[in-house]
Every structure is written in C-alpha cells, then in structure tokens.
Interface confidence: low
C-alpha cells in the first residue's frame, strides 16, 4: 500500500529573467527513493538517480540547475517556462509517486507567491 | 553525427581478461552516460551496467558483479569495459549504447559490437 | 529485478499486415519502456522511447503504447525491411535494466 505523499512549493511565480526553486518532498514513507524525475510537461529536464546522480537533459543544461536537495533551480526565467511541472519520484517498494507545481512568470516585478522559494 | 567506435574482435582464454574500448564522437561525452550490453550467440539482449561520464559513477548488474568494471576517460571521449575471469558463456557480442536522457534512458545510439570468445 | 515477457515469442506476417506485440512488466514501471529492432548481425535499433514517443528518424508505421505493466509495440503496415527480432527493455528500474527475450519477426 502507498501510503506517501508529496509536498511541493505549489503555485509559485517569479520574474521573467529570475531564478527559481522547484522543490518536492516525499513523506509519511519509509519507501526507498530510487530516482526521482522533473518533467515538463512532456518533456524531461533531469533525472537525479540514487546511485548514478544528478543529470540534466542536454537541451535545458544551460538555464537549469541541479538542487537544492532533489529540487530543481530554473535560471533567465522566460515567459515560455510558465507551465506545469511535475516530480516524479520513484520508491521502492511503492512504486510512483508524482507532485505538480505551476510556475507563473510574471512580465513585472510583483511575484509574491512563493517568494520564500525564489532566488534573489 | 553521433557515432560509436568499439575495439575490433578478441579471443580469450578461460580465466584471462579483456578490456573493450568504445570511442564516441559527435554530442558532447560528458552529458550522457554509457552502458554496456551484451548478446551470446543466438541469445537475447543482456544489460551488464552503465557508467555516467558525467561523474564516473556506475551501476553494474548484479551476476557480474565482482568481475565487471567500467571506466571512461573524458579527455578521449571514450568508455572501457573490463570483465574479468572470463568463462565461456562469456562469449558474446558486446556492445556499447549512449543512454539518451530525453529518451528516458532508451539506448539510443549503439556502437557497432565487439565479438569478444572464450575458448581454451 | 523487472521482468520483462513478450509475447509472442515468434510471428510469422506478410508485406502489408499489422503486426502487434506485446511486453508485459511483472511490477508497475509507468512509461519507462523502449522498444529496439535488431537486425542479424547488426546493433539494435532505439524504435520507440517512453512507451509510446517515436524515436527520430523511425517511419511513423511503428507506434508504442500502454503504461503500468502491460505495453505494445505495432507496425501498422510491415515492410520488406521491418522484418528483425524486436525487444523491449525498461529503464523505470535504473539500476537494474531488462529487456524482454525478443520476438522474432518473420516473413509468411
């Protein structure tokens, strides 16, 4: 039975041409974390693998960041990087279990949500 | 374009070891880990384990464990492959594989397979 | 470890048919599933990638699908050419890799 959950930095913005920390934590398992994946959308930004490390996908290696911990940082925010992204962290012997934030890139310079998060 | 280069054929006796080569070229080495796949005569796909030429680390599959080491050297873009004690199920192609992230780890482009027998 | 069972193991199909095979995982491994062609002689070939995301350069008659356990590699209309051993193989358990035993396709 999968009895974790995951806890993540929610709906967070940020400026356009900022900095910021995606983070998820899993808890309330004693489940191993294998690897844990961030995702766009559909697309891949890094594999943080328990034995292997960290590994970002070769078209985001110059605006991402691996950590704090097994977040992720995303540097020269874009309007295009607003979205949703997701953690998926793979345990054993649970199997799966997926966090989902959503970024709001902000044109001026009034992100409060989630500041705690954000990079100075 | 993205190539891999293995090392020609060899043949072992039982107990000795070999060491094959796998050159790459064409991506950029260090953003990819390599992993090493076998095929005895006749027989299936066997995953002996990886390395990430990121940082070196590797991962190897369980029954060879003890007899299998990977290494790479950045500097010449190429991946090595000891096995050691070598017996004769050894006899195998082997092959190289670039472990492409965006493909989730799909092995995604293939060196072109060293004939490695064991024969006494 | 993962297993990893393709069925079936060999087929026999004609120029023009539809083909499927499929993998089954014997634990959940959500869409960490390839499907490689291998050719006698020749190095596999990365067909399909994430279960069901066409590798570039393959020709669109190949798709994958499925997720959890149970997956499908089909070719909606076969080729002289297509005619090879496919395997699937799942990195969801990357330290420990599998491919499944191949099936084997041939021509009627």
């Known amino acids: 039975m999968m009895t974790g959950t995951i806890e993540t930095t929610g709906n967070i913005s940020a400026e356009k041409g900022g900095s910021i920390i995606l983070q998820c934590h899993l808890s309330s398992t004693t489940a191993q974390v294998t690897q844990v994946n961030w995702e766009q959308q559909d697309q891949l930004l890094a594999i943080c693998n328990a034995d292997l490390g960290w590994h970002i996908s070769p078209s985001f290696k110059d605006r991402v960041a691996p950590g704090p911990g097994l977040g992720l940082t995303l540097q020269s925010l874009t309007v295009n990087d607003a979205g949703e992204y997701f953690c998926i962290y793979h345990t054993y012997p649970d199997g799966t279990y997926t966090g989902r934030i959503f970024l709001e890139v902000l044109e001026s310079s009034v992100a409060e949500h989630g500041a705690r998060f954000q990079i100075p | 374009q993205v190539q891999l280069v293995q090392s020609g054929a060899e043949v072992k006796k039982p107990g000795a070891s070999v060491k094959v080569s796998c050159k790459a070229s064409?991506?950029?080495?260090?953003?990819?880990?390599i992993s090493w796949v076998r095929q005895a005569p006749g027989q299936g796909l066997e995953w002996m384990g990886w390395i990430s030429a990121y940082n070196g680390n590797t991962n190897y599959a369980q029954k060879l464990q003890g007899r299998v080491t990977m290494t790479t050297d950045t500097s010449t873009s190429t991946a090595y492959m000891e096995l050691r004690s070598l017996r004769s199920d050894d006899t195998a192609v082997y092959y190289c594989?670039?472990?492409?992230?965006?493909?989730?780890?799909?092995?995604?482009?293939w060196g072109q397979g060293t004939l490695v027998t064991v024969s006494s | 470890a993962i297993q990893l069972t393709q069925s079936p193991s060999s087929l026999s199909a004609s120029v023009g048919d539809r083909v499927t095979i499929t993998c089954r995982a014997s634990q959940s491994i959500s869409s960490y599933l390839n499907w490689y062609q291998q050719k006698p002689g020749k190095a596999p070939k990365l067909l399909i990638y994430?279960?069901?995301s066409l590798q570039s350069g393959v020709p669109s008659r190949f798709s994958g699908s499925g997720s959890g356990t149970d997956f499908t590699l089909t070719i909606s209309s076969l080729q002289p050419e297509d005619f090879a051993t496919y395997y699937c193989q799942q990195s969801y358990s990357t330290l420990a890799i599998t491919f499944g035993q191949g099936t084997r396709l041939e021509i009627k």
């Open positions: 994430a279960a069901s």
């Open positions: 594989a670039r472990a492409g992230w965006e493909q989730q780890l799909g092995f995604d482009y």
């Open positions: 064409g991506y950029t080495f260090t953003s990819y880990g």
